[in-house]
C-alpha cells in the first residue's frame, strides 16, 4: 500500500524546485523569493513574476522563501556575555559569540553563555579550550581537580572524592603528626 501524502507534501511536490504553489490557484506555480527578500504578492499567473520585496532593516531571510514577512534579527544576549561577531544583514541573521579565551556553555539548544577558559594554575593543560568546551586540566602532585580548578590537597576533607588523589599527601601529614620528635 502506498501511504497517502499529506496536504503539505502534496503542495510541495506539485511544483518544481524553486517554485511554490499559488495559495488561491493550485494550477499555478510561482517562483520563490530570493534570500534577503520576502513575498509581497503571489505571481498573477503562470510564467509571471512573483512580487518580492527586500527585507527592511532589522529583518532578514536566509534562504529562498515565500514568507509574508521577513524574520526579526536576533539580538546577542549581553547578560550571557555574548558579543556580536557579525551584524544582521537582509540575508543573514546576527552571529553571536564569545570573546577570546572564553567558551560557550549551552543552557539549551539555542541559548549559550560565555565563560572564561580555565588557566590550569597548579596544573597543566590536558586539552585546550575550545569553542564549546572548557580547558581540561591535569593537576600537579599535591593538588586535586575541583570544578576544573587545581586545589591544594590541604583542602581535601576525608569525605570528598579527592581522598584517593591526595592519599599519599594525607598519609604523609598523618605520618608527620604521629612520629615523635627526636
Amino acid at each position: 500500500l502506498v501511504p497517502h501524502l499529506g496536504d503539505r507534501e502534496k503542495r510541495d511536490s506539485v511544483c518544481p524546485q524553486g517554485k511554490y504553489i499559488h495559495p488561491q490557484n493550485n494550477s499555478i506555480c510561482c517562483t520563490k523569493c530570493h534570500k534577503g527578500t520576502y513575498l509581497y504578492n503571489d505571481c498573477p499567473g503562470p510564467g509571471q513574476d512573483t512580487d518580492c520585496r527586500e527585507c527592511e532593516s532589522g529583518s532578514f531571510t536566509a534562504s529562498e522563501n515565500h514568507l509574508r514577512h521577513c524574520l526579526s534579527c536576533s539580538k546577542c544576549r549581553k547578560e550571557m556575555g555574548q558579543v556580536e561577531i557579525s551584524s544582521c544583514t537582509v540575508d543573514r541573521d546576527t552571529v553571536c559569540g564569545c570573546r577570546k579565551n572564553q567558551y560557550r556553555h549551552y543552557w539549551s539548544e539555542n541559548l549559550f553563555q560565555c565563560f572564561n577558559c580555565s588557566l590550569c594554575l597548579n596544573g597543566t593543560v590536558h586539552l585546550s579550550c575550545q569553542e564549546k568546551q572548557n580547558t581540561v586540566c591535569t593537576c600537579h602532585a599535591g593538588f586535586f581537580l575541583r570544578e576544573n580548578e587545581c586545589v591544594s590537597c590541604s583542602n581535601c576533607k576525608k569525605s570528598l572524592e579527592c581522598t584517593k588523589l591526595c592519599l599519599p599527601q594525607i598519609e604523609n601529614v598523618k605520618g608527620t603528626e604521629d612520629s615523635g620528635t627526636t
Epitope: 556553555h105 543552557w107 539549551s108 541559548l111 553563555q113 565563560f115 570544578e147 576544573n148
Partner: nanobody
Framework: EVQLLESGGGLVQPGGSLRLSCAAS????????MSWVRQAPGKGLEWVSA????????YYADSVKGRFTISRDNSKNTLYLQMNSLRAEDTAVYYC?????????WGQGTLVTVSS
C-alpha cells in the same frame, strides 16, 4: 510526576538575607539544569538564576549579580538560592523551575517581601 516545592520565603528588611530551598522529586534531579524565576507584583516573569546539572556553570540576571548565589545538593535533590543585600525591588514570588528557558515545570512559588 514532577514535583518542585519551594520554601524559605518571608518578610525581610532591606539589606537582609534569605535562603530559598526547592525540594525536587519525580525526575532524575542530578541530570538537569535548574533555575530560579521570579514574578514581581504586576510584572512579567524574570529569569533570576540557573545552575547546570553538575553545579559547574551558573547564570545570574544583572539585577541580582553579586548578591544572589545559586547552589544545589544532588544527593538531597535540592536547589538553593542564597539572597543577600535584599532590596525592595526583589519583592516577588520566587519559582523553582526544571531546566532553563523555555521552562517545562514550575513549583507553586514562595513569596519574598522586602520591606521596612
Amino acid at each position: 510526576e514532577v514535583q518542585l516545592l519551594e520554601s524559605g520565603g518571608g518578610l525581610v528588611q532591606p539589606g537582609g538575607s534569605l535562603r530559598l530551598s526547592c525540594a525536587a522529586s519525580g525526575f532524575t534531579f542530578a541530570t538537569y539544569n535548574m533555575s530560579w524565576v521570579r514574578q514581581a507584583p504586576g510584572k512579567g516573569l524574570e529569569w533570576v538564576s540557573a545552575i547546570d546539572a553538575g553545579g559547574m556553570h551558573t547564570y545570574y540576571a544583572d539585577s541580582v549579580k553579586g548578591r544572589f548565589t545559586i547552589s544545589r545538593d544532588n544527593s538531597k535533590n535540592t536547589l538553593y538560592l542564597q539572597m543577600n543585600s535584599l532590596r525592595a525591588e526583589d519583592t516577588a514570588v520566587y519559582y523553582c523551575a526544571k531546566g532553563t528557558e523555555p521552562f517545562d515545570y514550575w513549583g507553586q512559588g514562595t513569596l519574598v517581601t522586602v520591606s521596612s
